[in-house]
Amino acid sequence: PGPPAGSPRVSSDPRADLDSAVLLTRSLLADTRQLAAQMRDKFPADGDHSLDSLPTLAMSAGTLGSLQLPGVLTRLRVDLMSYLRHVQWLRRAGGPSLKTLEPELGALQARLERLLRRLQLLMSRLALPQAAPDQPVIPLGPPASAWGSIRAAHAILGGLHLTLDWAVRGLLLLKTRL
């Protein structure tokens, strides 16, 4: 019997599996870029925003050249799970100022969940362990103010955008080596 309805049919070709993950990552990247631009229009950002609870960007000079598929998938999945938590938190605790972006944040969350499912599928196909985060999960408290939630949204979308770029570049680079 085939896969249950609604679940993606996975080929036996790891390049095709990677392709599928890259496609979802690129779609999510485009959504994130669009939402980040909307955020900047509605709530202009004054400089770079950061949030201590966000994962550190995985890529640094020199790391892309030495990437291995298990490391990329594991790191990406852990980081995206963190971003999913942050998007959920933003939708829950973002306050009235972010309510106008609720449909877009909801769509972003759905895309993130879909990409995470695809990565999980790819990892099980490659018999990779479904790694849990290294660090303990920091509970996310409510933002200190309306401006605090806006700054947090800028930081989350900016970080996700860069993480997804790292992911697309890493996955496509690995595909050339398969």
Partner: antibody
């Protein structure tokens, strides 16, 4: 106005290295990747590689791996491409170009730097 | 690497005429609604200029007489009514996989 301004023309001997700079202005430098493209006389445009200015993480076309080195100076909004072990086939115009994250299309280009390799 | 072949290599037309430039990929550069083909214009002594991205999206500031279409392996750049400043060389480029590659170009000349 969004601009990429490249360093001037270079004449080099075979075996030498060249380092080209690309100064970005008019946009947030870390919001886009910086790509480098070669255009040799009579040849098609060739992608050399790109670098994410936020992290300094480069990727390369396999053809240029080991000879091209991409770096950035975030504080100066400047990207650099160094090409080593130059040979006559490296005679070309080299462009830096602003790349959309994850999509590799190039919406802003530098004016180009001509590199001539000759003994 | 994906190879892009442009045709014709050169094309001589008059201002006001319609130009149709073709770009064929050695394998599909489309996937689930996205086509990773982009078009550039280049004039002698100048850098390339982005006209169309992701097959059919007009870059900001580019005149509406330029349009892009196609999917899979076959793509077209159309200039509906040629203006004097449109005579140049046009390149297609893909970004489906790494490395991105360019076509060899189509030179559009005044008849």
């Amino acid at each position: 106005e969004v601009q990429l301004v490249q360093s001037g023309a270079e004449v080099k001997k075979p075996g030498a290295s060249v380092k080209i700079s690309c100064k970005a202005s008019g946009y947030t430098f870390t919001d886009y990747n910086m790509d480098w493209v070669k255009q040799a006389p009579g040849q098609r445009l060739e992608w050399i590689g790109d670098i994410n200015p936020h992290s300094g993480g480069p990727i390369y076309n396999q053809k240029f791996t080991g000879r091209a080195t991409l770096t950035v100076d975030k504080s100066a909004s400047t990207a650099y491409m160094e090409l080593s072990s130059l040979r006559s086939e490296d005679t070309a115009v080299y462009y830096c170009a602003r790349g959309e994250l994850g999509h590799w299309y190039f919406d802003v280009w530098g004016q180009g730097t001509t590199v001539t390799v000759s003994s | 690497d994906i190879v892009l072949t442009q045709s014709p290599a050169s094309l001589a037309l008059s201002p006001g005429e319609r130009a149709t430039l073709s770009c064929r990929a050695s394998k599909s550069v489309s996937t689930s609604g996205y086509s990773y083909i982009h078009w550039y214009q280049q004039k002698p002594g100048q850098a390339p200029r982005l006209l169309i991205y992701l097959a059919s999206n007009l870059e900001s500031g580019v005149p509406a007489r330029f349009s892009g279409s196609g999917s899979g392996t076959d793509f077209t750049l159309t200039i509906s009514s040629l203006e004097e400043e449109d005579f140049a060389t046009y390149y297609c480029q893909h970004s489906r996989d790494l490395p991105p590659t360019f076509g060899q170009g189509t030179k559009l000349e005044i008849k």
